[in-house]
């Protein structure tokens, strides 16, 4: 399956925080989305192979890495002024 953690996170102002996403499905592609109240999902970053990733529609204030196939952590940087949202990680073949 796919595991995202933590379920809840509080960020101090000026801090970077990292959200973990791990999958054991042997999927090449992984995605991070953001959902604000009353809105649909918006793509932040996606990765289609190890060590390669592309910006989505709202990448500013976020960073990612894809050091291994199973993992695609998302860092919410201090530059992200409005981080409060629901974050969703996904993967696909």
């Amino acid at each position: 399956g796919i595991t995202q953690s933590p379920k809840y996170l509080f960020r101090k102002e000026g801090q970077n925080v990292t959200l973990s996403c791990e999958q054991n499905l042997n999927h090449d592609a992984m995605y991070w989305y953001r959902q604000d109240p009353g809105q649909g999902l918006r793509l932040i970053y996606y990765s289609q192979i190890v060590n390669d990733f592309q910006k989505g529609d709202i990448a500013e204030g976020y960073s990612v890495s894809r050091e291994k196939k199973e993992s695609f952590p998302l860092t919410v940087t201090s530059a992200q002024k409005n981080p409060t949202a629901f974050y969703l990680c996904a993967s696909s073949i």
Epitope: D28, A29, Q48, I49, V50, N51, D52, F53, S65, R66, E67, K68, S71
Partner: antibody
């Protein structure tokens, strides 16, 4: 910053096995990425030999596959190249190399290279 | 294997010149994911190659803006807009779309 350093004998006799080791500092080879061997015969171009992945899986150049083994020692954070049945055509500078983050499989971090001469 | 053919093999130019090196692959370098893994390196004698451009047109960090890459499919170019003395070296294209990863034969850029 990832740093790589090759070591091994500079002279190998024909028909013997060439053995080189790459010591990695600044990053654990089990944490991610692909750990490559690339060679360059004197005055010639670059040839990819193969890699060992963070999970221990391999990918080799088919032209060398029957003679090549790339392995690792995770306790020493090293990966190694063995090339059997060498001939003069295997004389080259051998580099170990790894990718830079976010560039796909393109390699950016290189060892300084070690010249291996095959001669009796 | 994918064959990478560079032209010219050698090139004489002067400081300040605009220089273009071409690289042609024997098959398309578009990956099944839509990306093109074509890269450029610079190598000076006795040194390991230095990374310049990745995925056709992305300058690696610290690479001067006078270096640019372009192309698609099977045809690619590296352009140096205004040659500097430190640019005289051998340049290689490389592909990592298909295994085995392969390199061009090199283009030696010399002072005229």
């Amino acid at each position: 910053q990832v740093q790589l350093q090759e070591s091994g004998p500079g002279l190998v006799k024909p028909s013997e096995t060439l053995s080189l080791t790459c010591t990695v500092s600044g990053y654990s080879i089990t944490s991610g990425y692909f750990w490559n061997w690339i060679r360059q015969p004197p005055g010639k171009g670059l040839e990819w030999i193969g890699y060992i992945s963070y999970d221990g899986s391999n990918n080799y150049n088919p032209s060398l596959k029957s003679r090549v083994t790339i392995s690792r020692d995770t306790s020493k954070n090293q990966f190694s190249l063995k090339l059997s049945s060498v001939t003069a055509a295997d004389t080259a500078v051998y580099y170990c190399a790894s990718p830079s983050p976010g560039t796909g499989y393109a390699v950016d971090y290189w060892g300084q290279g070690t010249l291996v001469t095959v001669s009796s | 294997d994918i064959q990478m053919t560079q032209s010219p093999s050698s090139l004489s130019a002067s400081v300040g010149d605009r220089v273009t090196i071409t690289c042609r692959s024997s098959q398309s370098l578009v990956h099944s994911n839509g990306n093109t893994y074509l890269h450029w390196y610079q190598q000076k004698p006795g040194k390991a190659p230095k990374f310049l451009i990745y995925k056709v047109s992305n300058r690696f960090s610290g690479v001067p803006s006078r270096f640019s890459g372009s192309g698609s499919g099977t045809d690619f170019t590296l352009t140096i807009s205004s040659l500097q003395p430190e640019d005289f070296a051998t340049y290689y294209c490389s592909q990592s779309t298909h295994v085995p990863f392969t390199f061009g034969q090199g283009t030696k850029l010399e002072i005229k």
